[in-house]
C-alpha cells in the first residue's frame, strides 16, 4: 500500500498558486506524484509522475472554488487522493507593495506600487483585481516604538512637517476594506529628513 502525500497545502501569493506537499516515508523506493484539478466535472492532470513535491496551479481562474488533488505513486501502485479546495480570490495572500521614498526637506514623499500578478500583463496588478484596494502606511521615528498609521487616498502620500535631521521609517501594505483583509507589510524604508523648509524672518 502506497501512503498518501502529507501536509498538502496551497501556498498562494499574488495568485502564484503552488500546491505543496511532503513525501511520506516509503521503504520500497522513491515515490512520484500526480496532481490534478477539477475542470467541468472531470479531473485534469497538471503535474504527472513528478518527483517534485509541488505543482504550479497559477493558471487557474481567479474566481470560484477549485478542487485540487494529489496522490503518490510507485510502479503500478498508488495512494488514495488527497483533496483540497482553494478559491484564489479569497485565499491568495496579498504580497507587499513596492514603495519609492524621496526626502524633500522636512517631508517624505512616497509612491506605492501594487503587487504584480503571476501570469498577467505587467500593468494588471492586485489593484485591478480588488475594487476596494487601498494602502495602509505605517511610519515611525527610527529607534522609537510609537507607530503612526495613515490610509492614503491615492498611490502616493506626503508626510509633512517632520522633525529635521531625523530618520523616519515607513512601510506599506495592501488592504481590502470590503473584505477586511490586510496584505503583508513591505520591508521598512528608513530615510533621514534634512532642514526645516521654513524661512527665518
Amino acid at each position: 500500500m502506497v501512503p498518501p502525500p502529507e501536509n498538502v497545502r496551497m501556498n498562494s501569493v499574488n495568485f502564484k498558486n503552488i500546491l505543496q506537499w511532503e513525501s511520506p516515508a516509503f521503504a520500497k523506493g522513491n515515490l512520484t506524484f500526480t496532481a490534478q484539478y477539477l475542470s467541468y466535472r472531470i479531473f485534469q492532470d497538471k503535474c504527472m509522475n513528478t518527483t517534485l513535491t509541488e505543482c504550479d496551479f497559477s493558471s487557474l481562474s481567479k474566481y470560484g472554488d477549485h478542487t485540487l488533488r494529489v496522490r503518490a505513486e510507485f510502479a503500478d501502485e498508488h495512494s488514495d487522493w488527497v483533496n483540497i479546495t482553494f478559491c484564489p480570490v479569497d485565499d491568495t495572500i496579498i504580497g507587499p507593495p513596492g514603495m519609492q521614498v524621496e526626502v524633500l526637506a522636512d517631508s517624505l514623499h512616497m509612491r506605492f506600487l501594487a503587487p504584480k500578478i503571476e501570469n498577467e500583463y505587467e500593468t494588471w496588478t492586485m489593484k485591478n483585481v480588488y475594487n476596494s484596494w487601498t494602502y495602509n502606511v505605517q511610519y515611525w521615528k527610527n529607534g522609537t516604538d510609537e507607530k503612526f498609521q495613515i490610509t492614503p487616498q491615492y498611490d502616493f502620500e506626503v508626510l509633512r512637517n517632520l522633525e529635521p535631521w531625523t530618520t523616519y521609517c515607513v512601510q506599506v501594505r495592501g488592504f481590502l476594506p470590503d473584505r477586511n483583509k490586510a496584505g503583508e507589510w513591505s520591508e521598512p524604508v528608513c530615510e533621514q529628513t534634512t532642514h526645516d523648509e521654513t524661512v527665518p524672518s
Epitope: 474566481y63 500593468t123 485591478n128 475594487n131
Partner: nanobody, 124 residues
Framework: EVQLVESGGGLVQPGGSLRLSCAAS????????IGWFRQAPGKGLEGVSC????????HYADSVKGRFTISRDNSKNTVYLQMNSLRAEDTAVYYC????FGLGCKSEADYDYWGQGTQVTVSS
Amino acid sequence: EVQLVESGGGLVQPGGSLRLSCAASGNSLDYPTIGWFRQAPGKGLEGVSCISASDGSTHYADSVKGRFTISRDNSKNTVYLQMNSLRAEDTAVYYCAASLFGLGCKSEADYDYWGQGTQVTVSS
C-alpha cells in the same frame, strides 16, 4: 446566452493596419473586462490585450505594445482592436472574450464568453 461576434480580419501586407471589432449579438457588452486573444497555427492561445470597464485602463502583451490599441465604444456596444505595423508573426485567429467577474486580463481561464474568431493573415 451571450454571443460575441468578431469582424475586421483579413489579409494585409507587413507594415499594414487592420481594425478588429467585437460586438455582443442582441446584448450589451457590459462586462468588467473584455479581452483579445490570438492563436497562431500550431500554437496555443495567447493573450493580446484587455480593457477594464471600471477605470477604462488598457493592458497589452509585450509583443504588441506600441502597435496595437484596444478601445471601446459604449454607444455601439463594441470593443475594437486597432492593429498597426503588422508583422508576419501577428498572423493568427483573433478571439474576443468577456469576463463576468473582471478579475483577470491575460489568462483565458478568467474569461467566460468567447467569440468564434476572425482570421488575420499578414503576408506579402
